[in-house]
């Protein structure tokens, strides 16, 4: 069956940085989406081979691609705190594929300590498990930030 | 040019089942919900179907549901209605529509096909 194959799974970075973002399949696809999730998933790219790149206006002059639809790389450049987000690869084939989801957080150089990508994937709960039909529902939810550290108290 | 071409129409007999197409070109249909509508002579444009731009949902007017079924290939860029149990009430010239929702990179575009005409008689 058809699968993406999306890598990081999480990534650090601090305001200003890039990350690079990569979605393989095994071809045959019509184009592929990089979206946002989130309570309302936004489309941040629209990629497909031979066709001008469509890009949400909020990333505009900041991203680049390499690669082909099939083994696209994303980079988004210039970070902003507000980009932190579960970012998923979506590929258009004849049925809904998802991949897995790439958990980036943007931090302010002094906070790096508890804004950490553990070695696991991102959360479950940020791609819905597929029903029974052939079509798959929109992702909905984003996986939560880390919960930063409980402060000590004072003595 | 954006293009959304409708066929399929004709006529059928009461209780008999007619297929529509909608074929887009000339923008990335995955990007937008697709519906249909239809318009009776002498009455307001009105939706019947519509289905979500991944096709993880759709809905159907009242009097359509457990009868007509909204599909979509977004892979050939193509809405469909399979219409089953047709009554005469369901004549109307029938429309294909495709609006950019919320979340999407193409939010506020909406386009319309041509028609086809569906007449339900014996």
């Known amino acids: 069956a058809q699968e993406v194959q999306q890598s990081p799974h999480c990534t650090t970075v601090p305001v200003g940085a890039s990350v690079n973002i990569t979605c393989s399949t095994s071809g045959g696809l019509r184009g592929i989406y990089l979206r946002q999730l989130g309570p309302q998933p936004q489309d941040i790219i629209y990629y497909e081979d031979g066709v001008v790149p469509t890009t949400d206006r909020r990333f505009r002059g900041r991203i680049d691609f390499s690669g082909s639809q099939d083994n696209l790389t994303i980079t988004m450049h210039r970070l902003q705190l507000s980009d932190t987000g579960t970012y998923t690869c979506q590929a258009i084939t004849e049925v809904n594929v998802y991949g897995s989801g790439t958990l980036v957080l943007v931090t302010e150089e002094q906070s790096q300590g508890w804004h950490r990508c553990s070695d696991a994937p991102p959360r479950a709960s940020a791609l819905p498990a597929p029903p029974t039909g052939s079509a798959l529902p929109d992702p909905q939810t984003a996986s939560a930030l880390p919960d930063p550290p409980a402060a000590s108290a004072l003595p | 040019a954006v293009q959304l071409v409708d066929s399929g129409g004709g006529l059928v007999q009461p209780g008999g089942s007619l297929g529509l197409s909608c074929a887009a070109s000339?923008?990335?249909?995955?990007?937008?919900?697709m519906s249909w509508y239809r318009q009776a002579p002498g009455k307001e444009r009105m939706l019947v179907a519509t289905?979500?731009?991944?096709?993880?949902?759709?809905n159907y007017e009242d009097s359509v549901k457990g009868r007509f079924t909204i599909s979509r290939d977004n892979a050939r860029d193509t809405v469909y209605l399979q219409m089953n149990s047709l009554k005469p009430e369901d004549t109307a010239m029938y429309y294909c529509?495709?609006?950019?929702?919320?979340?999407?990179?193409?939010?506020?575009?909406?386009?319309w096909g041509q028609g086809t005409q569906v007449t339900v008689s014996s």
């Open positions: 000339g923008f990335t249909f995955s990007g937008f919900d």
């Open positions: 289905i979500t731009r991944f096709g993880g949902s759709s």
């Open positions: 529509h495709a609006e950019a929702p919320a979340g999407s990179l193409w939010f506020g575009n909406n386009y």
